[in-house]
Interface confidence: low
């Protein structure tokens, strides 16, 4: 066949849908690869063709749009399943073409099973709520386009296995779920089940997301350097190993980039000739406050190294701070017979 611009298998868009539920999948060509939309392409006389490769098969097959009750259909640039079956899992390709132009992309579709508590291999989106921050809402995601605005669906919300009713601080409000005051105990998976009628049949859409309660911006502070501090002096003899931890606490801040770095005599360690290594570890609290530790290490410190300035720096969206480590050369213990005796005037 003639040449076709093949964008390959777009694994960035690993689409997961639940078994026995409707699914509408847009051809990714118009969203991510081409500079024009479906309407423009259609007006220009281009045709959209769909085909697929079953799981664990190499053979490309046309999609059967002649199934009972129109189970699989295409509408404009959308492939519809009403509903999906487990064996619909595979790689799907949409191809846009006419006699002179061809472009195609494939994407994986995985039909997954869920249990009665909505547990499944589905990758869940995470929605972050600020702790004790007043009313916050989550919205049942990815339900647009499944039914017209004239249809009024019923929506039931669950936390884990439990239907949300008479919860103290969580109130279902149609497509929204309101948290009157978010607490750590609100962490968990929340599921909305949207039920709607279509052509005499009833369909269910199940959408689960993970709620993570995080530190509130009300409580956010600039980075706090716990170490180095004024109470610890790093006293070393030449030839010993110098280890200085820089431990910094960062309040949780949405989309903030937390940075910790050392300077030695005002320069980044990479820009100086001494043999220094830096190891970093990161830990998080339950509200995603972050503690970063960068340990500066000089295996065999010299007397020159012990005269240098070692400064730990930290930066977040809340500000920048720095703290110098107190480093000094250990004074050798006096040898009594010579030095002390001299002190007593012995000759």
């Amino acid at each position: 066949s003639e040449r076709c611009d093949d964008w390959g298998l777009d694994t960035m868009r690993q689409i997961q849908v639940f078994e026995d539920e409707p699914a509408r999948i847009k051809c990714p060509l118009f969203e991510h690869f081409l500079k024009f939309n479906y309407s423009t392409a259609h007006s220009a006389g281009l045709t959209l063709i769909w085909y697929w490769t079953r799981q664990d098969r190499d053979l490309e097959e046309p999609i059967n749009f002649r199934l009972p009750e129109n189970r699989i259909s295409k509408e404009k640039d959308v492939l519809w399943f009403r509903p999906t079956l487990l064996n619909d899992t595979g790689n799907y390709t949409c191809m846009l073409r006419n006699t002179t132009y061809c472009s195609k992309v494939a994407f994986p579709l995985e039909v997954v099973q869920k249990d009665s508590c909505f547990n499944s291999p589905m990758k869940l989106p995470v929605h972050k709520l600020y702790i004790e921050y007043g009313i916050q809402r989550i919205t049942c995601p990815n339900v647009d386009g499944y039914f017209p605005s004239s249809v009024k669906p019923t929506i039931t919300w669950y936390m884990g296995c439990y239907k949300i009713q008479n919860f103290n601080n969580v109130i279902p409000e149609g497509m929204n779920l309101s948290f009157l005051i978010a607490l750590i105990s609100n962490n968990g998976n929340y599921t909305c089940v949207v039920t709607y009628p279509e052509n005499g049949r009833t369909f269910h859409l199940t959408r689960t997301l993970t709620v993570k309660v995080v530190g509130s911006p009300k409580n956010a502070v600039p980075p706090v350097i716990h170490s180095p501090n004024d109470h610890v002096v790093y006293e070393k003899e030449p030839g010993e190993e110098l280890l200085i931890p820089c431990t910094v606490y960062f309040s949780f801040l949405m989309d903030s980039r937390n940075e910790v770095w050392w300077t030695i005599d005002g320069k980044k360690p990479d820009d100086i000739t001494i043999d220094v290594t830096i190891n970093e570890s990161i830990s998080h609290s339950r509200t995603e406050d972050e503690t970063r530790t960068q340990i500066l290490s000089i295996k065999k410190v010299t007397s020159e190294d012990l005269k240098r300035s070692y400064v730990c720096h930290a930066r977040s969206a809340k500000g920048e701070v720095a703290k110098a480590a107190k480093v000094k050369q250990k004074v050798p213990a006096p040898r009594y017979t010579v030095e002390l005796a001299c002190g007593f005037g012995a000759t």
């Epitope: 547990n119 936390m159 884990g160 919860f167 103290n168 105990s185 998976n189």
Partner: antibody, heavy 119, light 108 residues
């Protein structure tokens, strides 16, 4: 520091019921889950079910559904586990454990309550 | 339900040695919700590790956890006399919550 204090040992007849209590002190009770785990003599640990007092809804392992009732009294910071239709194989130490959050690990445990079922 | 299989059933080691305990899940553990507990005779279990690798409050750094998906490991870098006990893994990511059968670490 939160502590969980359980009720004392019980000896029961087959077919009867037992109700074990678990009182929390020294911390927030309502917003954490309290779960129940049992351990038969010389055996491993077995999860029975749990409750989040603030929500009042309990869930339990299928094996125990219909026989176990898990409740909580927010006013006294106490959770209860009642097991009915007792049989000899229910002889075990019953532990309550605080679930650090709704999907967190069991970070604090009660001291255990020995329940012996014997005719 | 997720079945957790621990191996070996018994581990005979001397103080100061390294202990490696394995826990295998019958299916992937949701969100890495896997914990390790220590139980000494006549005592309630004690949380050592949660979230696969996070040490619980007050747990010495000789205890470490690792793994993902279906295979998890608890390592005790240097056994102390008080470490000889039974160790259980537990998944708390999906209901029903399940425990492994336990590994007994005994003095050789």
């Amino acid at each position: 520091q939160v502590q969980l204090l359980q009720s004392g040992a019980e000896v029961k007849k087959p077919g009867s019921s037992v109700k074990v209590s678990c009182k929390a002190s020294g911390g927030t009770f309502n917003i954490y889950a309290i779960d129940w785990v049992r351990q038969a003599p010389g055996q491993g640990l077995e999860w029975m079910g749990g409750i989040i007092p603030i929500f009042g809804t309990a869930n339990s392992a299928q094996k125990f559904q219909g026989r176990v009732t898990i409740t909580a009294d927010k006013s006294t910071n106490t959770a209860y586990m009642e097991l009915s239709s007792l049989r000899s194989e229910d002889t075990a130490v019953y532990y309550c454990a605080r679930n650090g959050a709704t999907s967190d690990a069991f970070d604090i445990w009660g001291q255990g309550t020995m329940v012996t079922v014997s005719s | 339900e997720i079945v957790l299989t621990q191996s070996p059933g018994t581990l005979s080691l001397s103080p100061g040695e390294r202990a490696t305990l394995s826990c295998r899940a019958s299916q992937s553990v949701s969100s890495n919700y896997l914990a390790w507990f220590q139980q000494r005779p006549g005592q309630a279990p004690r949380l050592l590790i949660y979230g696969v690798s996070r040490r619980a409050t007050g747990i010495p750094d000789r205890f470490s956890g690792s793994g993902s998906g279906t295979d998890f490991t608890l390592t005790i870098s240097r056994l102390e006399p008080e470490d000889f006990a039974v160790y259980y893994c537990q998944q708390y990511g999906s209901s029903p919550l399940t425990f492994g059968g336990g590994t007994k670490v005994e003095i050789k």
